[in-house]
């Protein structure tokens, strides 16, 4: 038995919006009908909390009101979207999966997905 | 899947020893860092300890008095406790997080990677 297996992209480039999209696809050992997914960023040495939603299968997925994240799922495949990114926030996002319900419990966590984020430069002033 | 059972806290006097044990069923310990963590009341759950195949790494507060340790062929996880202070009273949690080849020394023991919690077992360091 081994954990349970979580893919996402190695490399996203964030658009010049600061807005980065990526597929978070995992292989439920089971059935579950209640699904915790939770975005982790890993940078410095220093693990953060992105966002978390919990949902229930076949139903939309609801992050917090405040929440920088937005997402779909389809099956065992969570669309993610991260926004309002900027370079400092280039780093790798890694996708933690958790099947809450019904039991057993299964955890997965995938490699990471390392964001890219270049500032916009600024508009130069024109004449007219 | 993994079920983590873990045993051996109580009650003991400052200076004094405690070994803690989290037997893993379900699954094989290998493929996963495993960690202690404690919580004292009103506080947050902190980091003790975590190791994996080839690392262990220590939360600076206990560097020196703690000591974890896996033995795969019991599928059993192990902190020893020594000198034990008044303030390491707490609750002591055992978890599993699958083994990452992005992982650290500084972040493999990060409990937002943790999942399979255990109840948690209560050690009381007081005279």
């Known amino acids: 038995c081994k954990a349970m297996h979580v893919a996402q992209p190695a490399v996203v480039l964030a658009s010049s919006r600061g807005i980065a999209s990526f597929v978070c696809e995992y292989a439920s050992p089971g059935k579950a009908t209640e699904v915790r997914v939770t975005v982790l960023r890993q940078a410095d040495s220093q693990v953060t909390e992105v966002c978390a939603a919990t949902y229930m299968m076949g139903n939309e997925l609801t992050f917090l009101d405040d929440s920088i994240c937005t997402g779909t799922s389809s099956g065992n495949q969570v669309n993610l979207t991260i926004q309002g990114l900027r370079a400092m926030d280039t780093g790798l996002y890694i996708c933690k999966v958790e099947l809450m319900y019904p039991p057993p419990y299964y955890l997965g966590i995938g490699n990471g997905t390392q964001i890219y984020v270049i500032d916009p430069e600024p508009c130069p002033d024109s004449d007219f | 899947e993994v079920q983590l059972v873990e045993s051996g806290g109580g009650l003991v006097q400052p200076g004094g020893s405690l070994r803690l044990s989290c037997a893993a069923s379900g699954s094989t310990l290998d493929p996963f860092v495993i960690g202690w963590f404690r919580q004292a009341p009103g506080k947050e759950r902190e980091t003790v300890s975590c190791i994996n195949r080839s690392r262990t790494s220590y939360a600076d507060s206990v560097k020196g008095r703690f000591t974890i340790s896996r033995d795969n062929s019991k599928n059993t996880l192990y902190l020893q406790m020594n000198s034990l202070r008044a303030e390491d009273t707490a609750v002591y949690y055992c978890?599993?997080?699958?083994?990452?080849?992005?992982?650290?020394?500084?972040?493999?023991?990060?409990?937002?990677?943790?999942?399979?919690w255990t109840q948690g077992t209560q050690v009381t360091v007081s005279s």
């Open positions: 978890a599993a997080s699958p083994d990452k080849p992005f992982y650290t020394d500084q972040t493999m023991c990060n409990k937002h990677y943790y999942g399979y």
